[in-house]
């Protein structure tokens, strides 16, 4: 069973996040400089004619792009997709961004720019001020704050109104750690490293980021092929050879926004035996409530039994018991020459009265915890109340 | 960069440490090897140390050696030293390339011990 | 334990020519395979990680190949400077150990 229960479907991770309904409100929304007061942050709003009808930076975006739109969700999204247009002014607006670049935050403090799948950064935007320009972010971004920093190629103005959509990021996860994936050499390389990590990548040990191992996207039976257009073999996945691991497992450590109960981990494997893929033998799961704190209470063990012999991707689900923890570390025992993972998520409940905790490494940011969920949230819903989500589909207009 | 220091002449049995000093990171994300030389021979791996504190030693240095760690030194103690002992001791510090793969990237310029009555 | 043991010991070829050095590890490695260059009172030289993978700022005139067992780092257009002894190593994230080396001699 290939089924990620209790996982996000990147698909329906579509919902406008409140630009243009208004339920971010002014307060969330800043800048670097403004034109004007009737240019200022609060009139980026896509659709608005707030003001003189946008976002305009007082500065020059040419050649420094040091300019930037600040939206903070007051707490972790997924973003999808993202969309702008530029000044309105009664229809008499002539300014708009014909690329803009983003970069994006969890924890206020460590700031990551944004880049698709083969590593460009920069955007295509609008035309004209008044079209709406959706971007299909590939990969897609979880974030509590996102910067826009419009571009030009010459001096002259540009403006900016936005809309981001996504959806509430339930599973808490902040970053993971783990070791660097590997190639596999078959008769062509099969690149299993985790392209999208944003984290640090160091000795061996990418940590501090999240990646392709939480991106919703599930791995096909074939490891070779991709859900994904123009990438290389391998895309999907992240892998490890047990050759270059003496003690005969891959480790990983799992940070979390706050304290949580964990009932499950779901993690989605290959198990293309016939090229050396296989399931993992067993897991093993430590928890601990603080970074600098102890491991608790006994590790949890699960050995893997089921159908090894066949050799299509699954999801494994490895009971944790309802540990309540903030850290996980698990180690994933070799049955094979190769781990294969696509996809890790949890399933856990947030125990009542635990204060976010951002980022074990930083101190807890000013402005944390927030205050109140956005009104169109509650703590069980992924997306708002009464929208439809932007659909995903050939022809629409996303770039 | 890396530099060992502690090399000198001792005496059979002696216990010695040498201390590798990592300058420009952290050594907590790094596995770090010892390696030695004898004069005139190859290189002998003796132990590496993990980013979580984990030890491998080669099967001949089990009970030899004891490597130990901070985020800036890497110690190596030699227990009860042998005139076979006598060698350049390097630290090392693994890495990985574009395949995903570790290899040593980065060397000290090695500490020579000589065991001798 | 692991034993990779390294073949010839030492070879000798001219300037220009190409020489080849066979590494062998007692059971299979995959693709966990490095190799260094020393020169003579010098720290070694990291070349190739990952069989293939060749480290920064080495020329392309090094080459390795090979899978499991079996192994080989290939020099061709050989030039003086290469003149140095050989390792190959096996490097997962733990027991690392070394081939006995080949000296390479150019003439």
């Known amino acids: 069973d290939a089924d990620m229960k209790g996982h996000f479907d990147p698909a329906k991770c579509r919902y406008a996040l409140g630009m243009q309904d208004r339920t971010i409100p002014d307060s969330d929304i800043s800048a670097s400089s403004s034109w004007s007061d009737s240019t200022a942050a609060r009139h980026s709003r896509l659709e608005s004619s707030d003001g003189d009808g946008a976002w305009c930076p007082a500065g020059s975006v040419f050649p420094k792009e040091e300019e930037y739109l600040q939206v903070d969700l007051q707490r972790l999204h997924l973003v999808a997709l993202v969309g702008t247009q530029g000044r309105h002014a009664g229809g008499l607006g002539k300014e708009f961004s014909r690329s803009y670049r983003l970069r994006y935050s969890r924890d206020g403090r460590r700031w990551m720019g944004w880049k698709d799948r083969w590593g460009q950064e920069v955007i295509s935007g609008n035309e004209d001020p008044e079209g709406v320009v959706l971007k299909d972010l590939g990969p897609p971004m979880v974030a509590r704050l996102v910067r826009f920093y419009p571009r030009a190629d010459r001096v002259m103005s540009v403006c900016l109104r936005v809309e981001l959509y996504g959806c509430l990021w339930r599973d808490g996860l902040l970053s993971y750690t783990a070791p660097v994936g590997q190639t596999m050499y078959l008769s062509e390389a099969v690149y299993l490293n985790d392209s999208t990590y944003d984290g640090h990548t160091v000795g061996g040990l990418q940590y501090g980021g999240l990646g392709q191992l939480a991106d919703g996207v599930v791995g096909l039976d074939d490891f070779r092929k991709s859900q994904e257009l123009r990438v290389w073999p391998g895309y999907d996945y992240v892998g490890w050879s047990n050759h270059s691991f003496s003690s005969g497992y891959v480790e990983m450590e799992f940070e979390f926004d706050r304290l949580r109960a964990f009932q499950a981990m779901q993690v989605h494997c290959n198990n293309m035996h016939t090229l050396g893929a296989r399931l993992p033998g067993g897991v093993e799961c430590r928890f601990r409530r603080g970074p600098a704190m102890a491991w608790e209470g006994e590790p949890m063990r699960h050995n893997l039994g089921g159908n090894l012999g066949d050799p299509r991707a699954r999801a494994v689900s490895v009971p944790l018991g309802g540990r309540v923890a903030r850290f996980l570390q698990c180690r994933f025992l070799f049955a094979g020459p190769w781990l294969l993972f696509s996809e890790i998520s949890f399933i856990s409940d947030v125990v009542n009265n635990s204060s976010p905790a951002l980022g074990g490494t930083f101190p807890p940011a000013p402005w944390w915890p927030p205050g109140p969920p956005p009104t169109n949230f509650s703590s069980l819903e992924l997306e708002p109340r009464g929208q439809q989500p932007v659909a995903k589909a050939e022809g629409s207009p996303t770039a | 960069s890396l530099e060992e220091s502690g090399g000198r002449l001792v005496t059979p049995g002696t216990p010695l440490t040498l201390t590798c000093t990592a300058s420009g990171f952290s050594l907590n994300r790094y596995y770090m090897l010892w390696v030695r030389q004898a004069p005139g021979e190859g290189l002998e791996w003796i132990g590496t140390?993990?980013?979580?504190?984990t030890t491998y030693y080669a099967s001949w240095a089990k009970g030899r050696f004891t490597i130990s760690k901070t985020s800036t030194t890497v110690d190596l103690k030699m227990t009860s030293p042998t005139t076979e002992d006598t060698a350049t001791y390097f630290c090392a510090r693994a890495d990985t390339g574009d395949n995903g793969y570790l290899g040593l990237q980065l060397w000290g310029p090695g500490t020579l011990v000589t065991v001798s009555s | 334990e692991l034993v990779m043991t390294q073949t010839p010991a030492s070879v000798e070829a001219a300037v220009g020519g190409t020489v080849t050095i066979k590494c062998q590890a007692s059971?299979?490695?995959?693709?966990?395979l490095a190799w260094y260059q020393q020169k003579p009172g010098q720290r070694p030289k990291l070349l190739i990680s990952?069989?293939?993978d060749l480290a920064s700022g080495v020329p392309s005139r090094f080459k390795g190949s090979g899978s499991g067992t079996e192994f080989t780092l290939t020099i061709s257009d050989l030039e003086c400077a290469d003149a140095a002894t050989y390792y190959c190593q096996y490097i997962p994230y733990g027991s690392s150990p070394f081939g006995g080396g080949t000296e390479v001699v150019v003439k």
């Open positions: 059971q299979s490695i995959g693709s966990v």
């Open positions: 990952g069989v293939f």
């Open positions: 140390i993990s980013y979580g504190d």
